[in-house]
């Protein structure tokens, strides 16, 4: 807490300008009017204040707005945002995407801080859903943002927002998250033609069920191995050798290199060795010829 001291004669700041960088902390406290600071916040970012000086400016704004800053001030916080605590940010009502962008710019290139996480949470809750423009903005600054959300939070993403998602935004998503996102993507891209649809849906396929993979196998999509390896094991297991061959097209040869890894390993164990041999890849571990395969899960469902 800075002591209350009278402003020396001739030092009262008539405006926020570069001369203030030569003021000591107590002089800033005593000689800068908080209301003036609030109306001229847009100038602060253009002045090379030190961290210590920014502390004093924050203290002045806190006194002026004990219930939380108005958006007109928040939008121009600039580097002062780095001085805010999550508790400060919880008092804000940020509704403008421009304000959000301005504050994210301050933290650009750095890990998502608790302050930024709180800001985003406040903003998204205020909007009621994660709309396309917001998602566009957030993934531009934090490509991993989408995958940091819980499946419950992702459920509030409208299908229209999926258009803003880039493949790299899904890199760190786990299967539970893709389970939520895939149906939304399927809905969002449903009016696209075959090849265009596959390009868009590809990065979401980690959430696709067996029937959708079977349908894709009929469309000459030539799925690459990296995508295939991210598919749900339970969705891959029921696919026949012929379906996998159609699904992968020329990439089917890559199965050999992945035969010890999931889901390929588990899928091989479910196939007849005879069928695997038709691929000519030397895949081993299928069901030997002459063995009877009982699908117990089907039997249980019928009983």
């Amino acid at each position: 807490e800075v002591e209350k001291t009278a402003c020396p004669s001739g030092k009262k700041a008539p405006e926020i300008d570069e001369s203030l960088i030569f003021y000591k902390k107590w002089e800033l406290e005593a000689c800068v009017d908080a209301a003036l600071l609030a109306t001229q916040m847009d100038r602060v970012n253009a002045i090379p204040f030190t961290y210590e000086q920014l502390d004093v400016l924050k203290h002045k704004l806190d006194e002026l707005y004990p219930q939380g800053y108005p958006e007109s001030v928040i939008q121009h916080l600039g580097y002062l945002f780095l001085k805010m605590s999550p508790e400060d940010i919880r008092k804000w009502n940020v509704t403008s995407l421009e304000t959000l962008k301005a504050l994210l710019e301050v933290n650009k290139g750095h890990e998502m801080s608790p302050q930024v996480a709180t800001l985003i949470d406040r903003f998204v809750k205020g909007r009621g859903q994660l709309d396309k423009d917001t998602l566009d903005t957030l993934t531009a600054f934090y490509p991993g943002y989408l995958c940091s959300l819980s499946p419950e939070e992702l459920s509030s993403v409208p299908p229209s927002s999926i258009w803003a998602v880039r493949p790299q935004d899904l890199d760190t998503c786990d299967p539970r998250q893709l389970d939520v996102l895939y149906p939304k993507a399927r809905l969002a891209f449903q009016n696209m033609n075959g090849s265009e649809y596959f390009v868009k849906i590809q990065s979401f396929l980690g959430g696709a069920p067996t029937e959708d993979l079977k349908a894709l196998s009929q469309q000459n999509v030539s799925m690459d191995l990296a995508t295939f390896m991210k598919l749900r094991t339970d969705a891959v297991l029921p696919l026949t050798v012929a379906e996998v061959q159609k699904l992968l097209g020329p990439h089917v040869e890559g199965l050999k290199a992945e035969e010890r890894h999931r889901p390929v390993r588990d899928w091989i164990l479910r196939q007849r060795q005879d069928d695997l041999d038709t691929l000519g890849l030397g895949l081993q571990g299928g069901i030997p010829n002459g063995y009877l395969v009982l699908d117990l899960s089907m039997q249980e469902a019928l009983s």
């Epitope: 970012n45 002045i47 030190t50 961290y51 210590e52 580097y79 290139g109």
Partner: nanobody, 122 residues
Framework: EVQLVESGGGLVQAGGALRLSCAAS????????MGWFRQAPGKEREFVAA????????YYADSVKGRFTISKDNAKNTVYLQMSSLKPEDTAVYYC???????????????WGQGTQVTVSS
């Protein structure tokens, strides 16, 4: 790992000119404000100039205003200090530094280059 590498120092006659360069990693360059400082023998490190990442604002120490120009090339992740009308009192080791904020205080700069010697003879 953050790396700042200065170059361009040397010996020059009073009234002459030099251009210092500071190459940074792309991540540092795009997320930091960049500053130039100098330190003469037996003296404290002194602020010379800074360029703000947000808005591109520039600030100079009074001692170099009108003679030095700070600039940056985003494509090359490089910040420059063009020095002209050099004086013997400009003799020092010049350092490039990066900060999360736009500040005139050396304390606020997290990463520093190794420095490049500038000597101005009379």
């Amino acid at each position: 790992e953050v790396q700042l590498v200065e170059s361009g120092g040397g010996l020059v006659q009073a009234g002459g000119a030099l251009r210092l360069s500071c190459a940074a990693s792309e991540r540092t360059f795009s997320s930091s404000s960049m500053g130039w400082f100098r330190q003469a023998p037996g003296k404290e490190r002194e602020f010379v100039a800074a360029i703000n990442r947000i808005g591109g604002h520039i600030y100079y120490a009074d001692s170099v205003k009108g003679r030095f120009t700070i600039s940056k090339d985003n494509a090359k992740n490089t910040v420059y200090l063009q020095m002209s009308s050099l004086k013997p009192e400009d003799t020092a080791v010049y350092y490039c530094a990066s900060s999360r904020i736009y500040s005139h205080s050396a304390r606020d700069y997290d990463y520093w280059g190794q420095g490049t010697q500038v000597t101005v003879s009379s």
